[in-house]
């Protein structure tokens, strides 16, 4: 329990007085909090976060859902935190099986566990295939599996967080990675046509294709000098991952001279913009 | 217990802009990501984008880019929509919306957006 | 786009009866069996309220009336036996793939 010198606000203290508690399924959970100031209790994990005004923690029935960290806060903001397991062989882990991985980051398999004496809490491929050769990890029983620098090639991989009990693997249930990409390039695009001659009530149809690796790219259509909103549409196709592919095709029904100009397709990523024009001409 | 609150309605006049909150307790903010669903008689349920945990990214339906931006201020737990050169095809509901374990498992109550002149 | 078709767009069911919504998806939702679909109720004035998640499980809170199955393309919500509180309009919604896309609704009415 944390020591300060007197006349200096002082955390709470908790009891009893560890960093981490195991309990077994059905027991009771008892802290409790003592401080002149005391103000909550706050209990966290993965799903959500509640709160207790009573300066004694008590669950009658403890649940494996009440795992977590349980948090006391006095009136000058100061906390002191114990870590409560509850122990339930018939549920290892606590799972939120959203799983995004930003390319080149790192991002957490949310499996903590409910057991920390269990061993060999690690990652495991569905089905028995093997992780990735260069995926690397790094187990955390109170928050999950950190995955570390995510690749592009992880994209949809599916995975269990896996301990050994008594000498047999358990496995969570799946984990299905969806990596979004990092643009490492300007959007590719290009027109169908680079300049039109057409009589008045012609129709003007022009395309513009963009290629890029996600459908986060913004793409648009816009006239030179003017800022009115083109109407245009779309037809997209995902030719795999990470090949994304929009062609946006702007519309005049009916031509007429004053339409005459230069008409640019404008993309945009993360990384950069590209462009690329048509110029339109509308004679008598 | 988890809570999104918006505010009820909005009233904006063509061309303008609104920035529409959604304010988050109950849970850790910066856990989840928020996603904003726009709901109009016509179109019913459409998603505009996500704000993702943590780091902020964004990630839009092309529909929605360059009209909705998302942000959110991790110190108040609160998630931003800014929709900007309003139109009447605009007007509608919209809703955030929290990502737990796969699916959208609490929603704000919504908030109605009217664009009059 | 993955366009999500709800049929039928409204339906009158009588008290006790069952109800079945169907969703056809334009691909598939499935990834390693896991299918990505999910079934809101929405009653006028109120947010959607998640029902059923990844096809076939059952959200904390809901009545066991409701259930959900299907996988790859084709989905259904069953409700059996219906009860006068379950009138409202249902949606099924993919998160398989960006962008994320909603049926266009099924408007349930109990005779």
């Known amino acids: 329990q944390p020591s300060v010198s007197p006349g200096e606000p002082s955390p709470p203290s908790i009891h009893p007085g560890k960093s981490d508690l195991i309990v077994r399924v059905g027991d009771e959970i008892r802290l409790l909090c003592t401080d002149p100031g005391f103000v909550k209790w706050t209990f966290e994990i993965l799903d959500e976060t509640n709160e207790n005004k009573q300066n004694e923690w008590i669950t009658e029935k403890a649940e494996a859902t009440n795992t977590g960290k349980y948090t006391c806060t006095n009136k000058h903001g100061l906390s002191n935190s114990i870590y409560v397991f509850v122990r339930d062989p018939a549920k290892l882990f606590l799972v939120d099986r959203s799983l995004y991985g930003k390319e080149d980051n790192d991002t957490l398999v949310r499996c903590p566990l409910t057991d920390p004496e269990v061993t060999n809490y690690s990652l495991k491929g569905c089905q028995g295939k093997p992780l990735p050769k260069d995926l690397r990890f790094i187990p955390d029983p109170k928050a999950g599996i950190m995955i570390k620098s995510v690749k592009r090639a992880y994209h949809r991989l599916c995975l269990h967080c896996s301990v050994d009990q008594e000498g047999k693997s358990v496995l969570s249930e799946k984990f299905i990675l969806k990596v979004r990409p990092a643009f490492k390039a300007v959007p590719v695009v290009s027109v169908s046509k680079a300049s039109y001659l057409l009589r008045e009530g012609e129709e003007f149809t022009v395309t513009c294709t963009i290629k890029d690796v996600s459908s986060s790219v913004y793409s648009t259509w816009k006239r030179e000098n003017s800022q009115t909103k083109l109407q245009e549409k779309y037809n997209v196709w995902h030719h795999g991952d990470f090949n994304y592919e929009r062609q946006a095709t702007l519309t005049i029904s009916s031509a007429r001279v004053n339409d005459s100009g230069v008409f640019m397709c404008y993309a945009n990523n993360t990384f950069g913009s590209a462009n690329v024009t048509t110029t339109l001409e509308v004679v008598d | 217990q988890v809570q999104l609150q918006q505010p009820g309605a909005e009233l904006v006049k063509p061309g303008a802009s609104v920035k529409m909150s959604c304010k988050a307790s109950g849970y850790t903010f910066t856990s989840y990501n928020m996603h904003w669903v726009k709901q109009t008689p016509g179109q019913g349920l459409e998603w505009i984008g996500v704000i993702y945990s943590g780091n902020g990214d964004t990630s839009y339906n092309q529909k929605f880019k360059g009209k909705a931006t998302l942000t959110a201020d991790k110190s108040s737990s609160t998630a931003y929509m800014q929709i900007n050169s309003l139109t009447s095809e605009d007007s509608a509901v919209y809703y955030c919306?929290?990502?737990?374990?796969?699916?959208?498992?609490?929603w704000g109550q919504g908030t109605l957006v009217t664009v009059s002149a | 786009n993955i366009v999500l078709t709800q049929s039928p767009a409204s339906l009158a069911v009588s008290l006790g009866l069952r109800a079945t919504i169907s969703c056809r998806a334009s691909e598939s939702v499935d990834i390693y069996g896991n299918s990505f679909m999910h079934w809101y109720q929405q009653k006028p004035g109120q947010p959607p309220k998640l029902l059923i998640y990844?096809?076939?499980n059952l959200e904390s809170g809901v009545p066991a009336r409701f259930s959900g199955s299907g996988s790859r393309t084709d989905f259904t919500l069953t409700i059996d036996p219906v009860e006068a509180d379950d009138a409202a309009t249902y949606y099924c919604q993919q998160n398989n793939e960006d962008p994320y896309t909603f049926g266009g609704g099924t408007k349930l009415e109990i005779k």
């Open positions: 919306a929290r990502e737990r374990d796969t699916r959208f498992g609490n």
């Open positions: 990844l096809a076939s």
